[in-house]
């Protein structure tokens, strides 16, 4: 799986989409985890509706809610109140019993309000530890990035 | 009406390979998963993998993992079950088996082929 | 993977009789996906219920299913000539889709 990457501003919303075969994955509850570490497992965030047929309705936990359309085949999360700490890489998945399929692997970037003049810098990434391999971009505010281009080049 | 129609029976040696298929007609092949069952003479139903014809997505049993390879065609809407090296113990009638779909989700398995009956003799 | 176990393995009975068949899991069957299948001498097996509790196309109402979680039951209600075959419950929750050792519904 390539990564795509979402990038939001600090404080608003965010919307992650994960679009999938609606027939492969037909009956199958969806969810939302973040990865820890390049190796490490993918800690379950937020999961959509017990029962499949009301996947459509949203479901929250704290400021990440889900939502399935199950017809159309895509996943929708939306990270409320974008935070520095939000940052990093999950995974879109599709659930079968108590195993998964990756639809999707995410890389959120968090970029600082325009409108906030604090000294800091202008983006929040994950640690240098965790990987970042054939990553695209799939945002509005965002941009492709080239096979084996470094993401975020060193600034003085 | 959606149909599974299995190839014929099948007498070989053991070492032998083997490719049995079975053709879907009625429906979107592409569109549901396609599954293999095991029946020795005499016993029960045993699940020996599954595939996606849409992408060939496969997933094996852990007893059928190495033993036998999955595969389709989707310009022939056709699925197969194949052996590089049979054995007298893969004697068996052979079914393959459409993932059926509801409203509510997922639907069973339904309809079935008609079963290939697979003889390993020396 | 999620092992199956049906009970009794013969069950012995007069057309007219009711039937009751069970299929515990090892594990939870999340979704019940769970269905149920008969099959008789040289035929391919055929899908009596899915969902634990929803009939299949065709199937008549003398045949229901029932339960949640590890614990499933199949009743035929009025045992008709023809229903005396082999009954097979299956998950198709997680990969492997395991199959129960069957259940035999013979005359008495």
């Known amino acids: 799986h390539n990564t795509t990457v979402f990038q939001g501003v600090e404080g608003q919303s965010l919307q992650v989409s994960c679009p999938y075969d609606s027939m492969k994955h037909w009956g199958r509850r969806k969810a939302w985890c973040r990865q820890l570490g390049e190796k490490g497992p993918c800690q379950r965030v937020v999961s959509t509706h017990n029962l499949w047929l009301l996947s459509f309705l949203r479901r929250r936990n704290g400021s990440t809610a889900i939502t399935d359309d199950t017809l159309g085949g895509t996943l929708t999360i939306t990270l409320r109140n974008l935070q520095p700490h939000d940052a990093g890489f999950y995974q879109c998945q599709s659930l079968h019993g108590s195993e998964a399929d990756t639809l999707r692997k995410v890389l959120v970037e968090v970029l600082a309000d325009p409108l906030d003049h604090r000294d800091a810098g202008d983006l929040w990434v994950p640690g240098e530890s965790e990987s970042f391999e054939d990553a695209h971009v799939e945002h509005s505010i965002s941009r492709s990035l080239l096979e084996g281009e470094i993401p975020f080049p060193p600034t003085s | 009406e959606v149909q599974l129609v299995q190839s014929g029976a099948e007498v070989k040696k053991p070492g032998e390979s083997l490719k049995i298929s079975c053709k879907g007609s009625g429906y979107t092949f592409t569109s549901y998963w396609i599954g293999w069952v095991r029946q020795m003479p005499g016993k029960g139903l045993e699940w020996m993998g599954i595939i996606y014809p849409g992408d060939s997505d496969t997933r094996y049993s852990p007893s059928f993992q190495g033993q036998v390879t999955i595969s389709v065609d989707k310009s022939s809407s056709t699925a197969y079950l194949q052996w590089s090296s049979l054995k007298a113990s893969d004697t068996a009638i052979y079914y393959c088996t459409r993932q059926a779909i509801a409203v509510t989700g997922l639907g069973g398995f339904d309809p079935w082929g008609q079963g290939t009956l697979v003889t390993v003799s020396s | 993977e999620i092992v199956l176990t049906q009970s009794p393995g013969t069950l012995s009975l007069s057309p007219g009789e009711r039937a009751t068949l069970s299929c515990r899991a090892s594990q939870s069957v999340s979704s019940s996906y769970l269905a149920w299948y008969q099959q008789k001498p040289g035929q391919a097996p055929r899908l009596l219920i899915y969902g634990a509790s929803s009939r299949a196309t065709g199937i008549p109402d003398r045949f229901s299913g029932s339960g949640s979680g590890t614990d499933f039951t199949l009743t035929i209600s009025r045992l008709e000539p023809e229903d005396f075959a082999l009954y097979y419950c299956?998950?198709?929750?997680?990969?492997?889709?395991?199959f129960g050792p069957g259940t035999k519904v013979d005359i008495k």
């Open positions: 299956q998950q198709y929750d997680t990969s492997p889709f395991t």
